[in-house]
């Protein structure tokens, strides 16, 4: 797949990594994660126009069929290509503990 | 993440595997693929409501933030969790060749 990286819709409009500020309450974690109130989450947001960061052949097919049958086949979607690990400090019966999650923070993005 | 498999929107409305019939022309492959002429493309289509087939912790976060900031954070998206290989008979300068593509047909789906 041609892995175009220039967004035809204008700067910042296409699929890319964004950082979203959130509180533990926002995430629904206030009852089991012990941490300051504000956290940063990296996630993949943005449009997936033709040939932009196509993850694979499937994404290419999907875009071609979306053009032909837009009511049936959705456009490719901006999702994480890989993740960064993050350690959560969790509340436990006996106090607190560390747990590493490998699938929590998006590291980079592509269109699928 | 709780990996719910019952669609709260009604049968067939949530993220699942669909088969879409397409010709080589539809796929934009007529000039380099000899066979098959008609392809049944399996792809992931459907909505991703809360807790439905959440791929990982990231999808859970994304849904929670989408509820709070729908204009900023999109809902999780229905994408392939794995792929089935497919063999294409391709035109070459010297004749034809067989090529296996591992990322062409969706095998199962989840929400990311």
């Amino acid at each position: 797949a041609r892995n175009g990286d220039r967004c035809p819709l204008g700067p910042g409009r296409c699929c890319r990594l964004h950082t979203v500020h959130a509180s533990l309450e926002d995430l629904g974690w206030a009852d089991w994660v012990l941490s300051p109130r504000e956290v940063q989450v990296t996630m993949c947001i943005g449009a997936c126009p033709s040939q932009f960061r196509e993850a694979n052949m499937h994404a290419q097919i999907k875009m071609n069929l979306h053009r032909l049958k837009p009511d049936t086949v959705p456009a490719p979607c901006c999702v994480p290509a890989s993740y960064n690990p993050m350690v959560l400090i969790q509340k436990t019966d006996t106090g607190v503990s560390l747990q590493t999650y490998d699938d929590l923070l998006a590291k980079d993005c592509h269109c699928v | 993440a709780r990996n719910g498999d019952r669609c709260p929107l009604g049968p067939g409305r949530c993220c699942r595997l669909h088969t879409v019939h397409a010709s080589l022309e539809d796929l934009g492959w007529a000039d380099w693929v000899l066979s098959p002429r008609e392809v049944q493309v399996t792809m992931c289509i459907g909505a991703c409501p809360s807790q439905f087939r959440e791929a990982n912790m990231h999808a859970q976060i994304k849904m929670n933030l989408h509820r709070l900031k729908p204009d900023t954070v999109p809902a999780p998206c229905c994408v392939p969790a794995s792929y089935n290989p497919m063999v294409l008979i391709q035109k070459t300068d010297t004749g034809v060749s067989l090529q296996t593509y591992d990322d062409l047909l969706a095998k199962d789906c989840h929400c990311v």
């Epitope: 940063q40 990296t42 960064n84 350690v87 923070l105 | -």
Partner: antibody, heavy 123, light 108 residues
Framework: QVQLVQSGAEVKKPGSSVKVSCKAS????????VSWVRQAPGQGLEWMGG????????NYAQKFQGRVTITADESTSTAYMELSSLRSEDTAVYYC????????????????WGQGTLVTVSS | SYELTQPLSVSVALGQTARITCSGD??????VSWYQQKPGQAPVLVIY???NRPSGIPERFSGSNSGNTATLTISRAQAGDEADYYC??????????FGGGTKLTVLG
């Protein structure tokens, strides 16, 4: 094998600034939190602040707020610490240290350290 | 701001058990890490989250944490264990806090 290699020793005049670099190799630079910790001669460890390249923002210990700037260049996998308005009490070995991203706290669990950079402030 | 207090020095006979304490208000509800620093070298993480050891750290090193005291325990102390040891946690705003450090001397 993760390695953090720091720039060489510096001698600075009071009132001036110093910028120390820390180049990472053997790991994914942006996936971790990089902190700066200093140690005055014969004294203990003191956290100055840190940066998470993927977030781009730095956090600083209150004591150093306004006087320290921590940056990161992902293209070269290098973190920098600049300390301004130097005084004799800033004479110390400055370490960069890497750890996982810790939800909310962000810095700590320093599993890899640079070799240290001695900064001497003297008139 | 949150403070961690360590004894300046601890002595242990070769082959015996050394215990280094780290006191802080309700430290039992904090995550505590321990670092070993030998003269002229950078610190090394030896214990995190009560009693987890990074790879390469001998089983002789263990940790515990409850109430107002966290403890680093080094069993069967060796001459090579002689070093400064620092505890570390976070304050309420997420800043990293180190204890003042304890010099461990192995006698004999």
């Amino acid at each position: 094998q993760v390695q953090l290699v720091q720039s060489g020793a510096e001698v600075k005049k009071p009132g001036s600034s110093v910028k120390v670099s820390c180049k990472a190799s053997g790991g994914t630079f942006r996936s971790y939190a990089v902190s700066w910790v200093r140690q005055a001669p014969g004294q203990g460890l003191e956290w100055m602040g840190g940066i998470i390249p993927i977030f781009g923002t730095a956090n600083y210990a209150q004591k150093f707020q306004g006087r320290v700037t921590i940056t990161a260049d992902e293209s070269t996998s290098t973190a920098y610490m600049e300390l301004s308005s130097l005084r004799s009490e800033d004479t110390a070995v400055y370490y960069c240290a890497r750890g996982p991203i810790i939800m909310g706290y962000q810095f700590g669990l320093f599993d890899h350290w640079g070799q240290g950079t001695l900064v001497t402030v003297s008139s | 701001s949150y403070e961690l207090t360590q004894p300046l020095s601890v002595s242990v006979a070769l082959g015996q058990t050394a215990r280094i304490t780290c006191s802080g208000d309700n430290i039992g509800s904090h995550i505590v890490s321990w670092y070993q620093q030998k003269p002229g070298q950078a610190p090394v993480l030896v214990i995190y989250d009560k009693s987890n050891r990074p790879s390469g750290i001998p089983e002789r090193f263990s940790g515990s944490n409850s109430g107002n005291t966290a403890t680093l325990t080094i069993s069967r102390a060796q001459a090579g264990d002689e070093a400064d040891y620092y505890c570390q946690t976070w304050d309420s705003i997420g800043s990293v806090v180190f204890g003042g450090g304890t010099k461990l001397t192995v006698l004999g």
